[in-house]
Interface confidence: low
């Protein structure tokens, strides 16, 4: 006899034996127990062998059981969730053999001083790992290699002084990383790789700002909208990004993202990115925007531009992602806003002296008769980046622009593949005529077409940049015009700022602007690095259009794409998809490579 209560939870029998002064597993538990709560007892030690006959056991809670040792000598083939939090465990046994189906492992609030290298071997299904509030001083290399499906990793409140450089390698699904309240001094070069991490917590460490911190600094600049300050009891989705929470312990707690890095060598390979204080005057290799659709906070992620080798100026590449799968939570799109410092939240101070981008290449592919790889004939709602100028706290359908933060959102259930690849060639200057006008006309059978024009002038090589005006029509929920003015930063040595005005008129919701006419060409924007240099003309190979427009010398070009009824569709750009990427001549490592 025992005092455990039982409950029904779908097909699982839930047995609650919490706080019953148990010193061992009750002898008469139902054989079909699916959820077992043993928390707040005095078990001391626990062996999985005691549960092997519970073939339905899916959730096991052993929190606050005064555990000093755990033995994994019995296989629990269905166990998905194991809670070992708030115990006195100083070490963990290898778990993979005994718990092959484990998806959530909570060993927080224990006394783990270290982890053996193979402790997670075999946990191929693990999605959440909670190790916060232990005494971890280091992590073994390759710790997370077996856990390729990991989504949440909490290492907060430990004593970590450093991180293995490849800790996150292969964790393509990782979306939340807690590293706050450790003793970290720096982040290893390349630590984050190309991962999209919507939620990262890095505050309350001993960040030491010197030349070794430059990689981390650049990453923070790129991911300013993804760095948060953790608060007890507050859901991360309800908080505001706070990249300034990551501070230099040695520089009077100045934010790491604004560390000048003056005097640091730029050619020693300190970072995975170029140092923008001294970038060579060569074309950019790519501009990328990633966004996540798995949370309600849709954040623009800027991948800083890398300089192409001088030997490759005749051929460069813009990399686009493989065909979008609805089940994935990452997509990548070309986007027409240069990732200047003005895209950081309002709380940050722009410092163009430290962080000015000298070269930006932007592509908006035009509609084409090429069918997407899914052979979908009609323009169903597809994966469309919808750029709205609003802060994170702005309601979703707000039409009030806030020019300090750029949010990228997308419909969550889209099914149309996104563009795959585009080839850029850079001919020698002054060898190709440059059209300077593009007429953008919307298609709407039931209404008068709305002409949208952008008249752009190609200046002579000089230090004066030319203002541009674009009128874009956006179908929003309101008919109230929403004027938006963006003053764009000019290159450092320019003496004339370039104002750009975008006037948005918002017709009735029924006026659905679905696409651009097929004659509209891709728009390529190239920003010069210095006023003295001759404009670098970058031409898009004409796979599917007959025109192109070169927009030279603009530091930033902003394309407003509305939420809801988007009128800029992104069709396939080239006939290269993810399953042919390895053999594609376009994907030579000399150019660029697909993003994950």
């Amino acid at each position: 006899q025992h005092t455990c209560s039982i409950s029904k939870v779908t097909s699982l029998l839930e047995v609650n034996c919490e706080n019953k002064k148990l010193t061992a597993l009750p002898a008469d538990l139902p054989a079909d127990t699916g959820i077992l709560h043993l928390g707040e007892n005095q078990l001391g030690t626990f062996s999985t062998a005691s549960l092997v006959h519970f073939t339905h056991l899916t959730y096991l809670y052993l929190d606050r059981c005064e555990l000093t040792s755990l033995q994994t000598n019995g296989k629990l083939i269905k166990l998905e969730n194991l809670d070992l939090s708030h115990n006195n465990l100083k070490s963990l046994p290898s778990l993979g053999w005994a718990l092959p189906a484990l998806t959530t492992l909570d060993v927080s609030f224990n006394k783990l001083g270290s982890l053996s290298p193979g402790v997670l071997d075999g946990l191929s299904q693990l999605q959440e790992l909670y190790l916060q509030n232990n005494d971890l001083k280091s992590l073994p290399p390759g710790l997370l290699l077996p856990t390729t499906k990991l989504k949440k990793l909490n290492l907060a409140n430990n004593k970590l002084r450093e991180l293995p450089s490849g800790l996150l390698d292969g964790l393509e699904d990782l979306d939340t990383l807690y590293l706050q309240r450790n003793w970290l001094r720096t982040i290893p070069k390349g630590f984050f790789g190309t991962l999209l991490l919507p939620f990262v917590f890095l505050h309350a460490n001993s960040w030491y700002c010197d030349c070794e911190i430059l990689y981390f600094r650049h990453w923070l600049q790129e991911n300013a909208n993804n760095v948060y300050l953790w608060k007890q009891g507050v859901d991360v989705k309800d908080t505001t990004p706070n990249v300034a929470s990551v501070r230099c312990a040695n520089l009077d707690n100045a934010p790491v993202y604004s560390y000048p890095g003056k005097g640091c060598p730029t050619s020693s390979g300190d970072t995975d990115y170029d140092d923008y204080d001294d970038i060579p005057d060569v074309p950019a290799t790519r501009t990328e925007v990633k966004f996540s659709t798995n949370t309600k906070v849709h954040t623009t992620h800027w991948s800083l531009l890398a300089a192409a080798p001088s030997t490759s100026q005749d051929s460069q590449m813009i990399s686009l992602p493989p065909t979008h799968k609805p089940t994935k939570k990452q997509s990548t799109f070309i986007h027409t806003q240069s990732p200047g410092f003005t895209t950081l939240p309002e709380t940050m101070e722009s410092n163009p002296t430290f962080y000015s981008l000298k070269l930006n290449t932007v592509l908006i592919p035009s509609p084409t008769t090429l069918e997407p790889t899914s052979t979908q004939a009609t323009p169903e709602p597809n994966i469309q980046p919808m750029l709205t100028t609003s802060t994170l706290t702005t309601p979703e359908h707000s039409t009030t622009p806030v020019p300090t933060t750029t949010i990228l959102t997308t419909p969550e259930h889209s099914t149309i593949p996104v563009p795959t690849t585009a080839i850029l060639t850079t001919p020698k200057p002054s060898t190709i005529p440059v059209p300077t006008t593009a007429t953008l006309t919307t298609l709407e059978p039931s209404t008068t077409p709305v002409p949208t024009t952008a008249t752009l002038t190609t200046p002579e090589p000089s230090t004066t940049l030319v203002p541009t005006t674009a009128t874009l029509t956006t179908p929003e929920h309101s008919t109230t015009p929403v004027p938006t003015t963006a003053t764009l930063t000019t290159p450092e040595h320019s003496t004339t700022p370039v104002p750009t005005t975008a006037t948005l008129t918002t017709p009735e919701p029924s006026t659905t602007l679905t696409n651009l006419v097929s004659t509209i060409s891709p728009v390529l924007t190239t920003t010069l690095t210095t006023p003295e240099s001759t404009p670098i003309e970058t031409i898009l190979e004409q796979f599917f259009t007959t025109e192109l427009t070169l927009l030279p010398t603009l530091e930033s070009t902003t394309t407003i794409i509305p939420e809801q009824n988007s009128f800029l569709n992104l069709p396939e750009v080239a006939l290269v998809s993810s399953d042919t990427s390895e053999s594609s001549p376009f994907l030579n490592s000399d150019f660029c490579c697909f993003l994950p």
Epitope: Q1, S5, I6, S7, K8, V9, T10, L13, D28, L29, P30, A31, D32
Partner: antibody, heavy 118, light 113 residues
Amino acid sequence: EVQLVESGGGLVKPGGSLRLSCAASGFTFSSFAMSWVRQAPGKGLEWVSSITSAGTPYYPDSVLGRFTISRDNAKNSLYLQMNSLRAEDTAVYYCARSRGYEDYFDYWGQGTTVTVSR
Amino acid sequence: DIVMTQSPDSLAVSLGERATINCKSSQSLLNSRNQKNYLAWYQQKPGQPPKLLIYFTSTRESGVPDRFSGSGSGTDFTLTISSLQAEDVAVYYCQQHYSSPWTFGGGTKLEIK
């Protein structure tokens, strides 16, 4: 037809013991959880105990440690051993078949009366 | 323990009229994983054992007339007899089968007006 027939009730002094039995027929007894539910005179229904098809017993706090439920699948029988009886245990005791786990009761016996009195 | 409270204690309704009995639980009986409410209704006629009428709030047991229906969610539930018949005179009990110990309401005595 499902039938449940209780027996073993009677008059007993406080502190005394009784053993109730329930004979089941008309269904595969070993496949079902079984329960005892009681009803004090003029009062409502109170769950007393359940036992899973695998033989795991459950009790409310009011009888825990005093009552023991058991089953004999070979005899298609359910039992309730009642010790340390109190006046408040006086009631009609129903044997009931539980649907699924020990949850709701789809067939009931006619009941047997237990009276605890000096 | 989950406490079940029925109202009214007794109810008199004319033949052919609608009878409504309420049952309230001290905590939600809704299982969010399968969206089922774990509530059953029983009918007990004088001198007889209870008879199962409805389980999972609204699922009628086989053989129960369709004039009996159950509704509700979370903590508030209702048993409705759409057209009272003479044989419906009885005491009606609700019972939660969500979490042990299984508990019953105090009962509602239904009479003919």
